[in-house]
């Protein structure tokens, strides 16, 4: 019998209100055994996969999706989903990213390496089929 997959969670570092030009990292978290995390934006219209998944604790895996320089177009709703073969999980709750005008230049220098995933993609109709493979591998490019 296949296990029920717990819903992932999503958070943003350093927060959900980000000055224009600053960086933000979305953190997706799930259970042990996750193979791929997907960060979806605005009801699956765009998404980004990473297979760079680490075990943060004995019970929780995580992946990080980094935007180096936030633009106004990055504002919106984001959520996570994960692939634990042979099933996709349910989606996390939405997290809303707000972008505010900054009074000065970009904020302080980066303080975290933050792994990065590949380029934005349009999902195919089966992007959440239980047997859809991870849609791409690791690339040293940044989101959006």
């Amino acid at each position: 019998q296949e296990e029920d997959l717990p819903r992932p969670s999503i958070s943003a570092e350093p927060g959900t209100v980000i000055p224009l030009g600053s960086h933000v990292t979305f953190v997706c978290r799930g259970p042990v055994g996750v193979q791929t995390f997907r960060l979806e934006r605005d009801s699956r219209s765009t998404y980004n996969d990473t297979e760079d998944v680490s075990q943060a604790s004995p019970s929780e895996s995580e992946a990080r999706f980094r935007i180096d320089s936030v633009r106004e177009g990055n504002a919106g709703l984001y959520r996570c989903i994960y692939y634990k073969p042979p099933k996709w999980s349910e989606q996390s709750d939405y997290l809303e990213l707000l972008v505010k005008e900054s009074s000065g230049g970009p904020d302080s220098p980066d303080t975290e390496p933050g792994s990065s995933a590949g380029p934005t993609q349009r999902p195919s109709d089966n992007s959440h089929n239980e047997h859809a493979p991870a849609s791409q591998g690791l690339k040293a490019e940044h989101l959006y």
Partner: antibody, heavy 116, light 110 residues
Framework: EQSVEESGGRLVTPGTPLTLTCTAS????????MCWVRQAPGKGLEWIGL?????STAYASWANGRFTISRTSTTVDLKITSPTSEDTATYFC????????????WGPGTLVTISS | ELVLTQTPASVSEPVGGTVTIKCQAS??????LAWYQQKPGQPPKQLIY???NLASGVPSRFKGSGSGTEFTLTISDLECADAASYYC????????????FGGGTEVEIK
Amino acid sequence: EQSVEESGGRLVTPGTPLTLTCTASGFTISDYHMCWVRQAPGKGLEWIGLIRASHSTAYASWANGRFTISRTSTTVDLKITSPTSEDTATYFCARYGGSGIGCNLWGPGTLVTISS
Amino acid sequence: ELVLTQTPASVSEPVGGTVTIKCQASQSIDSNLAWYQQKPGQPPKQLIYAVSNLASGVPSRFKGSGSGTEFTLTISDLECADAASYYCECTYYGNSYVGGFGGGTEVEIK
């Protein structure tokens, strides 16, 4: 019952490329990352590399250039590009179980002997 | 490059005793650690994953602990069937570094 099995191990002369093949039963191999590990006679386990479901690869630093891992929809291959006597070992294929789990479903191994 | 150092290389303990095997990582690997048992002529068998989770069918005499760079496998109430080699594995193969296996520990039961 889920299982993996290696094939292709044999005696070859130094410098002769050799390809080992891993097949799966009871699960769809293309859904999973797959690992290759070797063990020389009387020695410990050596992780060679891994191929992800997306076909991207990762290798141990010592194995880079000496081995090539590839996959089709039904198999995962390990090519030993230019074997030397030091590559004599039992070669294991294993399914990667996901974050925190590692290479947890192993085949019985296939013996490769490099000798002139 | 990540290095996993296992100690001791070998150990001998009586039936009913306890064995402690240490695995030290050259950098923090969070909870990306598993433990394996291997007997001659057989492939490795997973005992512990994600530091402290018991693999299916493994008795609770096997216990994993640790975090960051220092990890421990403890086998209590030793049985003759526990005579084997034991290996730790860093299970992360991502962008930051790639894992691999420790050098192994041979456990003999007196």
